[in-house]
Interface confidence: low
């Protein structure tokens, strides 16, 4: 198996190849980047920037009706999310749903074999602790840049502010406080899939300080799943400085979004499962992580698993063969989206509808079976890819057929016996789906019999013959008569006609040769006759 | 099915040029992503370039160095390489990959192309 390229590969082209081994549902996928807010508590109001993507997809391919004229897989995904600061009290790391994500950008694309789907860079939001009793500030989250890039926007806390005011009023310059500056800020997470790890950016602010380093020094090679709290963070135009928290999120890595549609179902059903690979639960809280996965035009269909992720299947059934459907499937880190993916699965072919047939009028050996042209009905039934015709008298023949084919003349059949000609119509999608079996029935005509089987003469006295023998192998008709014809030189002597193939021939001549001749007569037909020599004695008396 | 038919390669001094090309037939393959791929002895095989829907990407490595291009009338995918380096030296494949409307997709690989570039 070749390995997936690293997220480092270059951000302001597209993504690359991933080369898989075994092929998986391959699905035009559109990844939306999230562009939503994280609310929290005593929130009350919520941002929304234009999302950008930035996860690497695999193999881009064309997709009709796409929004963009080309398909950008590596840029960086933005998303902010706003958040108060709650008074006094630190705040949790909690966020709502988020809304829905506006400005949208279709990025079409096919998914790997295996890994499944791509996903979508995740974008995440940090919450901070507040510890100003005074007033509450706007604070934002960050977004992943490069390979995966998440964007959240943290809340600050404030630095305490002396509360008493001076008996003077003293016109000064003051620096902007540092909770103004960094309330809104957005960071940009940057995911390293090589070493699994996360850089973060403070996005717009020159020269940030994290304590007395400098934050492009310390916000980098940051664990996934991590959390780093009450970060002093504040830079030479603000004081006094600032405090944030980081969430770190999962790598987008993890998730990959797989068909679980069994083929025999995948006509009307279709089973998606976001699955984790590599995620250390230990260090991730499955509590901070959720999916919510849904198909289009099913409305009220979702499958939702919130604040606990445990990978299981979501299966729509009931869907109409060979039809579009957009499925959403959206996995959220602490509420906010951190993979979001839309992709079009088209459900499988339909069973065909397969025609009557009709068996004609058949000779003694063969028949023409034809059925009309199949009607094309693709709200339900999908057109033949081919028939399988079959027909039994004991035992039972199939012959394929291709779907150009209306008529088959069905040969070497037994003459005057009853058939059953069963005709399906069958498609090729991902398994071969049958049709129901139409049928017909017919009845051969008679054919000449066999001989018959075993014949034997013997004498019983002097001057008379027993003649006996079996049935044809085949007597290819309705009826059985046996008929025994006595010949001597050359010469018509008698005649029998019995049901049964036991003659008694006497009163002959003495000493006489006799031809004795039979054949079997099946109502309609008389076939070949066995002729076997036998001679009378003299007369002992 | 999808035949991959790599041709260029071969020995080079550094610095020098080189390009490869790999022919598509037995499918129209329009709607494809084609991309070429490496593997230096030892190594795993790992991503140069890629082209989908007139979109380009390169690995850092090659950047600015080589050029993937698609000739969608012919169906042929090219890369020219400039200023070659031994460390480009790999056996080369060609990778084509489609999406079917009933949701699989499939992968196809070139026979592979030598390119040795060694003083």
């Known amino acids: 198996q070749t390995p997936t390229p690293s997220d480092e590969l270059s951000t302001t082209e597209n993504a690359l190849l991933l080369p898989q081994s075994d092929p998986l549902p391959a699905r035009t996928t559109e990844s939306t980047p999230p562009s939503i807010s994280e609310r929290g508590n005593g929130s009350s109001e919520t941002t929304y920037h234009p999302g950008v993507l930035s996860t690497l997809l695999p193999h881009l391919s064309p997709q009709p009706d796409s929004q963009t004229p080309s398909a950008g897989g590596a840029d960086t995904q933005t998303f902010s999310s706003q958040a108060d600061n709650p008074t006094l009290t630190p705040a949790p790391g909690g966020g709502t749903d988020p809304p829905g994500v506006p400005g949208e950008r279709t990025v079409p694309g096919t998914i790997p074999a295996d890994t499944a789907f791509p996903v979508d860079t995740p974008s995440l939001a940090r919450n901070s602790s507040a510890a100003s009793p005074t007033h509450t500030s706007n604070v934002s989250t960050t977004d992943i840049s490069s390979g995966a890039s998440l964007t959240t926007l943290t809340p600050s806390t404030l630095g305490l502010a002396s509360t008493d005011p001076p008996s003077t009023t003293i016109a000064t310059t003051t620096k902007q406080t540092c909770a103004a500056m960094f309330g809104n800020i957005t960071v940009n997470y940057t995911y390293e899939s090589s070493n699994q790890t996360f850089k973060a950016d403070l996005k717009d602010v020159q020269n940030a300080k994290c304590g007395n380093e400098d934050c492009e020094n310390v916000l980098n090679n940051l664990e996934e799943c991590s959390q780093i709290k009450n970060i002093s963070v504040s830079n030479d135009s603000c004081a006094p400085a600032t405090t944030i928290d980081l969430y770190v999120p999962p790598g987008t890595d993890k998730f990959s979004l797989h068909d679980c549609t069994p083929k025999e179902k995948a006509n009307t059903s279709i089973c998606l499962e976001w699955k984790t690979k590599n995620l250390d639960f230990r260090k991730c809280n499955s509590d901070n992580i959720s999916y919510v996965l849904h198909c289009e035009p099913e409305n009220n269909t979702k499958c939702i698993r919130r604040n606990t992720f445990i990978p299981e299947r979501c299966q729509l059934d009931n869907l109409r063969a060979q039809t579009n459907y957009t499925c959403v499937a959206e996995i959220l880190y602490r509420g906010v989206k951190l993979v979001k993916n839309v992709i079009n699965v088209q459900t499988d072919l339909g069973i065909p509808e397969t025609p009557k047939p009709s068996c004609g009028d058949p000779a003694a050996r063969k028949t023409l079976v034809s059925w009309p042209e199949p009607v094309s009905k693709p709200e339900s039934a999908s057109k033949p890819h081919g028939y399988v015709l079959c027909y039994k008298n004991n035992s039972e023949k199939c012959k394929s057929l291709p779907n150009n084919v209306t008529s088959f003349e069905v040969e070497s059949l037994k003459p005057y016996k009853y058939y059953e000609v069963s005709l399906l119509a069958y498609v090729n999608g991902k398994i071969q789906r049958n049709g129901t079996a139409e049928k017909c029935n017919f009845h051969t005509k008679a054919d000449r019999p066999d001989k018959v089987n075993g014949m034997k003469t013997s004498r019983p006295t002097d001057n008379s013959i027993n003649v006996t023998c079996g049935p044809p192998y085949e007597t290819n008709g309705p009826k059985t008569f046996y008929i025994l014809v006595v010949r001597s030189g050359g010469s018509f002597v008698t005649k029998y006609n019995k049901t049964n193939c036991q003659f008694y021939v006497d009163n002959l001549y003495y000493s006489t040769d006799y031809e004795f001749l039979v054949s079997f007569h099946n109502g309609v037909y008389e076939g070949d006759s066995v002729i076997r020599n036998e001679s009378t004695n003299f007369n002992a008396k | 099915q999808v035949q991959l038919v790599q041709s260029g390669g071969g020995l080079v001094q550094p610095g020098g040029s080189l390009r490869l090309s790999c022919a598509a037939s037995g499918r129209a393959f329009n709607s494809a992503a084609m991309g070429w791929y490496r593997q230096a002895p030892g190594s795993q095989r790992e991503l140069v370039a890629s082209?989908?829907?007139?979109?380009?990407s390169y690995a850092d490595a090659v950047k600015g160095r080589f050029t993937i291009s698609r000739d969608y009338a012919k169906n042929i995918i090219y890369l020219q390489m400039n200023s070659l380096k031994p460390d480009d030296t790999a056996v080369y494949f060609c990778n084509y990959r489609t999406t079917y409307t009933s949701g699989y997709s499939e992968d196809y690989w070139g026979q592979g192309t030598q390119v040795t570039v060694s003083g």
């Open positions: 082209i989908s829907a007139g979109t380009a």
